[in-house]
């Protein structure tokens, strides 16, 4: 029962996480205009992975897509790639985990197969969550780098008479959605891996035991129940302890110019 609950909860948490990763990827507010120096701006700028937008006080919002692939910064491309890989892995993981759910019966699928599928989906969720967290973190790092770069030369002009205020960008809502969603997917994946341990059969080796039955004696030797009479090879509700989650290579991020509008 606890295994089913853990698996079910892991699935639901991962589902919410992946929905969040998809939402974050599609959102336009990855970076938003920093209003510290001009809190009463009549024009508000914000940017996403796919387009940049301008919202006026009038209510008019204009968005322009980045209609170039080669002209975009490598770091932005990397973030896009990480988020897409996260979504794809998460989607495949969801598909696999649906068939792996203990509460769903599909033909005569053995528990060992369900355990393997649960572990596979769990690992996929973990990698998916890591991809999302890495993607969002790389973007956040780009923002921080550019924020201080633009702060350094915030005001330019002719003898200080005319001020040209450079637009600075800060963390947008999508970053927080991405971090939370990535974390949820990661947690869901770990829960699936834990559930996997409770699903699979356990090949247990027993010490030799002698039974003195009426009429004759039978000696049970180590090596399991495969050849023993009366017990058969019923592996239901036995546990297998598998190594669980594998560690992924760490994603290294480097400061980059975030200036793609």
């Amino acid at each position: 029962m606890a295994v089913t609950a853990c698996q079910g909860l892991g699935f639901v948490v991962s589902l919410i996480g992946i929905a969040g990763i998809i939402a974050a990827t599609c959102m336009d507010q990855w970076s938003t205009q920093d209003l510290y120096n001009n809190p009463v701006t009549a024009v508000f700028n914000y940017q996403g992975l796919w387009r940049s937008c301008v919202r006026e006080s009038s209510g008019f919002t204009e968005c322009r897509g980045y209609f170039t692939l080669l002209g975009l910064p490598a770091m932005l491309q990397a973030v896009r790639a990480l988020m897409i890989v996260g979504i794809v892995l998460g989607a495949i993981g969801l598909l696999v985990s649906i068939f792996a759910l203990k509460c769903i019966r599909i033909g005569s699928m053995e528990d060992s197969a369900k355990a393997n599928m649960t572990l596979t989906s769990g690992i996929m969720f973990i990698v998916s969550g890591l991809c999302a967290i890495a993607g969002v973190s790389v973007f956040a790092n780009m923002l921080v780098t550019n924020f201080w770069m633009s702060t350094a030369n915030m005001y330019t002009g002719m003898g200080g008479m005319v001020q040209t205020v450079q637009t600075r960008y800060t963390f947008g809502a999508a970053l927080f959605v991405g971090w939370v969603a990535g974390g949820l997917t990661l947690i869901g994946g770990v829960m699936m891996c834990i559930a996997c341990r409770g699903l699979a059969p356990e090949e247990t080796n027993y010490k030799a035991v002698s039974y003195h039955a009426s009429g004759h004696s039978v000696a049970y030797k180590p090596g399991g129940f495969k050849a023993s009479t009366g017990f058969g090879s019923n592996t239901k509700n036995k546990k297998i302890y598998d190594g669980g989650a594998r560690t992924e290579d760490e994603v290294q991020s480097y400061p980059s110019k975030h200036d793609y509008v």
């Epitope: 205009q33 001009n38 009463v40 701006t41 009549a42 024009v43 700028n45 914000y46 940017q47 940049s52 937008c53 301008v54 006026e56 006080s57 009038s58 209510g59 008019f60 204009e62 322009r64 005319v162 001020q163 040209t164 205020v165 450079q166 637009t167 509008v261």
Partner: antibody, heavy 118, light 113 residues
Amino acid sequence: EVMLVESGGGLVQPGGSRKLSCAASGFTFSDYGMAWVRQAPGKGPEWVAFINNLAYSIYYVDTVTGRFTISRENAKDTLYLEMSSLRSEDTALYYCARFTTGNVMDYWGQGTSVTVSS
Amino acid sequence: DIVMTQSPSSLTVTAGEKVTMTCKSSQSLLNGGNQKNYLTWYQQKPGQPPKLLIYWSSTRESGVPDRFTGSGSGTDFTLTITSVQAEDLAVYYCQNSYSYPLTFGSGTKLELK
């Protein structure tokens, strides 16, 4: 046809209060931000206040902050400007205007005159 | 606050003449997000409210004759009337539409010789 009609102007004592109204017609009032602009005799226009279509974004010029309150009633297609602690420098023709793309005021009323004098 | 400075304060012209008036802002009105200049021009005739002529520095409002042309970027802007007509005699105001408070220039009065 877009129409904006201001009312509520008149002679007010210094320190007194007044509430201006602007009745809108000919467009979907709740889709647009609105503004009040005033023009003192022989002077240029001065933007006074702005309210967005859903009334959650409001801005005032520094000289009226704390004294004037802009509000709107979308159900009645009406814009208001509540003025208190009036001063002689608030004497002007008060226009209400529709705010649109480009943060511009594309339609203006004919204005209502407010005179602050003892 | 952004200060808008208009020059000249008045212009005396003859019908058919080309007229140019300028407007300078104390801060750039160019928005990097959409590369648009938030500078607006209004025309005000005596006894009437201001009328919108040009927004985004160069976009003509519908119904405005094409003899009115707006140009400029950043902090320096120009309104040009290619062939002045009698009905163009008015005061022209530029306005910052980029940042609150939405400040107006002091105006350029167009008069007939």
